[in-house]
């Protein structure tokens, strides 16, 4: 697994560099997770033809993956910092169950899958410190998450492969939109 942000060789070699600001740390954390997702996507795409499949809709019906929309206030038009931050944190919390599902889905990248999951937890903590309106953030129900996880794990092999591909793709897209939005804050 790659070295977490702030622990790369450049940081070690440059002890006099200015410490990262909160925004820079968040930005770096997201890019670190995105790099992890890229590695996981490589394994998924090499292992199956899911990345080229046109049957994504079949599996997407089972999923309720968080998506960014105009109303969330994260796009340049209608940008709203507080609404957007709530959407990002809520979305990340909703993704956690899907990241848990990914944990047993990789052979050569098992460590990488764990790193993505743990780094996302750290990112949520960073963002919660930044949010003023924590009351507006709804935490997913653990019971609902547990039954969703059971349902996903009970799918046939093809659907499980497709689900893995869709989770990684959607999480990547959500993080990229979040990255762009957070840079406007």
């Amino acid at each position: 697994a790659p070295v977490p942000p702030g622990e790369d060789s450049k940081d070690v070699a440059a002890p006099h560099r200015q410490p990262l600001t909160s925004s820079e740390r968040i930005d770096k954390q997201i890019r670190y997770i995105l790099d992890g997702i890229s590695a996981l996507r490589k394994e998924t795409c090499n292992k199956s033809n899911m990345c080229e499949s046109s049957k994504e809709a079949l599996a997407e019906n089972n999923l309720n993956l968080p998506k960014m929309a105009e109303k969330d206030g994260c796009f340049q038009s209608g940008f709203n910092e507080e609404t957007c931050l709530v959407k990002i944190i809520t979305g990340l919390l909703e993704f956690e169950v899907y990241l848990e599902y990914l944990q047993n889905r990789f052979e050569s990248s098992e460590e990488q899958a764990r790193a993505v999951q743990m780094s996302t937890k750290v990112l949520i903590q960073f963002l919660q410190k930044k949010a003023k309106n924590l009351d507006a953030i709804t935490t997913p129900d653990p019971t609902t998450n547990a039954s969703l996880l059971t349902k996903l794990q009970a799918q046939n092999q093809w659907l499980q492969d497709m689900t893995t591909h869709l989770i990684l793709r959607s999480f990547k897209e959500f993080l990229q939109s979040s990255l762009r939005a957070l840079r406007q804050m």
Epitope: D27, R31, A69, Q76, S177, R180, R183
Partner: antibody
Framework: EVQLVESGGGLVQPGGSLRLSCAAS????????MIWVRQAPGKGLEWVSD????????YYADSVKGRFTMSRDISKNTVYLQMNSLRAEDTAVYYC?????????????WGRGTLVTVSS | DIQMTQSPSTLSASVGDRVTITCRAS??????LAWYQQKPGKAPKVLIY???TLESGVPSRFSGSGSGTEFTLTISSLQPDDFATYYC????????FGQGTKLEIK
């Protein structure tokens, strides 16, 4: 062959409108960040707008915000730039281009450009 | 918009010279900066991205450095083909360019 071909440029009066098209081939716009850049005659490059493939999120330079709209038609693999309330200072060669990777870091593919002249 | 200020606007130099072009961002952009070379009537060509990564196929005499708000492009030994206009571009948010540096023969 991977390429971008712009069209739709021409002469237009101040206050008028024009729609530029950028047809992509050899790759799909639905999984790439796209960008419009312009260059006034004898001047430097100016970023105009970009469109993030996910959710079609657009971002505009202050100089064109509220007047220009970037959009796409995935079925035609084409990106558009709708330009309204045109001004003399919008006269330029308009390039359609592609950001190179997932965290846009550089432009790796450019069209040949289409000339827009705003004059009465 | 993030403003990119490039200097100098014109630079006169001779073949074999070492030249440096500077680019300053109006706010921190981490390492999200690219350098391009443009020749008359042509589209720009990327030389350096992420502040210091040399694009494949670009001669090693080109190098980039910097982070945050201050960046430099250095050509260690000018070649005849290097006389052109150079631009920096940030990709932190949007994609604004510097105003360009015209490198001309002294």
């Amino acid at each position: 062959e991977v390429q971008l071909v712009e069209s739709g440029g021409g002469l237009v009066q101040p206050g008028g409108s024009l729609r530029l098209s950028c047809a992509a081939s050899g790759f799909t716009i639905s999984s790439n960040y796209m960008i419009w850049v312009r260059q006034a005659p004898g001047k430097g490059l100016e970023w105009v707008s970009d469109l993030y493939y996910y959710a079609g999120d657009t971002y505009y330079a202050d100089s064109v915000k509220g007047r220009f709209t970037m959009s796409r038609d995935i079925s035609k693999n084409t990106v558009y730039l709708q330009m309204n309330s045109l001004r003399a200072e919008d006269t330029a060669v308009y390039y359609c281009a592609r950001w190179a990777d997932d965290h846009p870091a550089w432009v790796d593919l450019w069209g040949r450009g289409t000339l827009v002249t705003v004059s009465s | 918009d993030i403003q990119m200020t490039q200097s100098p606007s014109t630079l006169s130099a001779s073949v074999g010279d070492r030249v440096t072009i500077t680019c300053r961002a109006s706010q921190g952009i981490s390492s999200w900066l690219a350098w391009y070379q443009q020749k008359p009537g042509k589209a720009p060509k990327v030389l350096i991205y992420k502040a210091s990564t040399l694009e494949s196929g670009v001669p090693s005499r080109f190098s980039g450095s910097g982070s945050g708000t201050e960046f430099t492009l250095t050509i260690s030994s000018l070649q005849p083909d290097d006389f052109a206009t150079y631009y920096c571009q940030q990709s932190w948010l949007g994609g604004s360019f510097g105003q360009g540096t015209k490198l001309e023969i002294k």
